[in-house]
Interface confidence: medium
């Protein structure tokens, strides 16, 4: 009970950390300008990963896709594949954890096969969660490192000067949600990765068998039946009775007066 | 290539009335924020006028009511109409694009300037 507990909480962590991380990627708020010093009109400039937008104090909000991939920092390209590697990571687990799922039946899916599913949708969050972290945490050390007051250094370029307009550049809503989101993707994964465990058959020595008595000749057998789970082998080498003993596939299916388990 | 072009100034006596253009290339000129600015000898460049892609006007206190901003989309072209010049209006006038949108980096473009003397 506690497993399934554990994996259905993981997977609705990682839904959410999931969504959280696609909300994040589309947002526009990555980060905010506040153009205090523009003696046109009070504009609050913000930028997300695909385009850049304005909204001056008269409420008129205006955004357009960044132009060309040429003028974009190296950085922002790199947090653009992060968060979609951290999306793509994410949603294949979602559908691994989907079929994984310990209250969903599926045909006749061991245990066995559900503990490596949960595994790998486990490790699929963990990755995803923390790609959205570090793609995140980049972008605001870009902001921190390189634009925290942009330089108004003046350049002459055909037709004229070129600047860039002196803001201030802060963090934007988007940074935050994505951080959320890793964090709760993260947790999600490693809650997986738990219940992966619980979900793993415990190794059994021995198979349901009957025992059939013939005679007195029982014979006291090293090694015997060892439930064939593929994880791990009997190392202690118990010894367990097997006087002429099949196992509950091979007993005949009519009773015996000497048949008994 | 962006390219801001001034032109309209001159020799003016006090009074009189100017037209300032400024054609733009490689930039729309109903960008996010167009604008006149203005450097009289010896002192820092000022703002005079200007315009937002939201149609927000706005001017310095000293050319309120004497000065017009307006642009003409048709043309890519911003205009700068000055009335009763005074004296004090003597200077070079500069045509500004800041654009905020499509670019990650916010830009400002400068023209090369266009100089209006006032002067009986």
């Known amino acids: 009970m506690a497993v399934t507990a554990c994996q259905g909480l993981g997977f609705v962590v990682s839904l959410i950390g999931i969504a959280g991380i696609i909300a994040a990627t589309c947002m526009d708020q990555w980060s905010t300008q506040d153009l205090y010093n523009n003696p046109v009109t009070a504009v609050f400039n913000y930028q997300g990963l695909w385009r850049s937008c304005v909204r001056e104090s008269s409420g008129f909000t205006e955004c357009r896709g960044y132009f060309t991939l040429l003028g974009l920092p190296a950085m922002l390209q790199a947090v653009r594949a992060l968060m979609i590697v951290g999306i793509v990571l994410g949603a294949i687990g979602l559908l691994v954890s989907i079929f994984a799922l310990k209250c969903i039946r599926i045909g006749s899916m061991e245990d066995s096969a559900k503990a490596n599913m949960t595994l790998t949708s486990g490790i699929m969050f963990i990755v995803s969660g923390l790609c959205a972290i570090a793609g995140v945490s980049v972008f605001a050390n870009m902001l921190v490192t390189n634009f925290w007051m942009s330089t108004a250094n003046m350049y002459t370029g055909m037709g004229g000067m070129v600047q860039t307009v002196q803001t201030r550049y802060t963090f934007g809503a988007a940074l935050f949600v994505g951080w959320v989101a890793g964090g709760l993707t993260l947790i999600g994964g490693v809650m997986m990765c738990i219940a992966c465990r619980g979900l793993a058959p415990e190794e059994t020595n021995y198979k349901a068998v009957s025992y059939h008595a013939s005679g007195h000749s029982v014979a006291y057998k090293p090694g015997g039946f060892k439930a064939s789970t593929g994880f791990g082998s009997n190392t202690k080498n118990k010894k367990i009775y097997d006087g002429g003993a099949r196992t509950e596939d091979e007993v005949q299916s009519y009773p015996s007066k000497h048949d008994y388990v | 290539q962006v390219q801001l072009v001034e032109s309209g100034g001159g020799l003016v006596q006090p009074g009189g009335s100017l037209r300032l253009s400024c054609a733009a290339s490689g930039v729309d000129i109903s960008s996010d924020v167009m604008a006149w600015y203005r450097q009289a000898p010896g002192k820092q460049r000022e703002f005079v006028s200007g315009?937002?892609?939201?149609?927000?006007?706005n001017y310095a206190d000293s050319v309120k009511g004497r000065f017009t901003i307006s642009r003409d989309n048709s043309k890519n072209t911003l205009y700068l109409q000055m009335n009763s010049l005074r004296a004090e209006d003597t200077a070079v006038y500069y045509c500004?694009?800041?654009?905020?949108?499509?670019?990650?980096?916010?830009?400002?473009?400068w023209g090369q300037g266009t100089l209006v003397t006032v002067s009986s």
């Open positions: 315009l937002t892609r939201g149609g927000s006007i």
């Open positions: 500004n694009a800041e654009i905020y949108t499509g670019t990650f980096y916010p830009r400002s473009y």
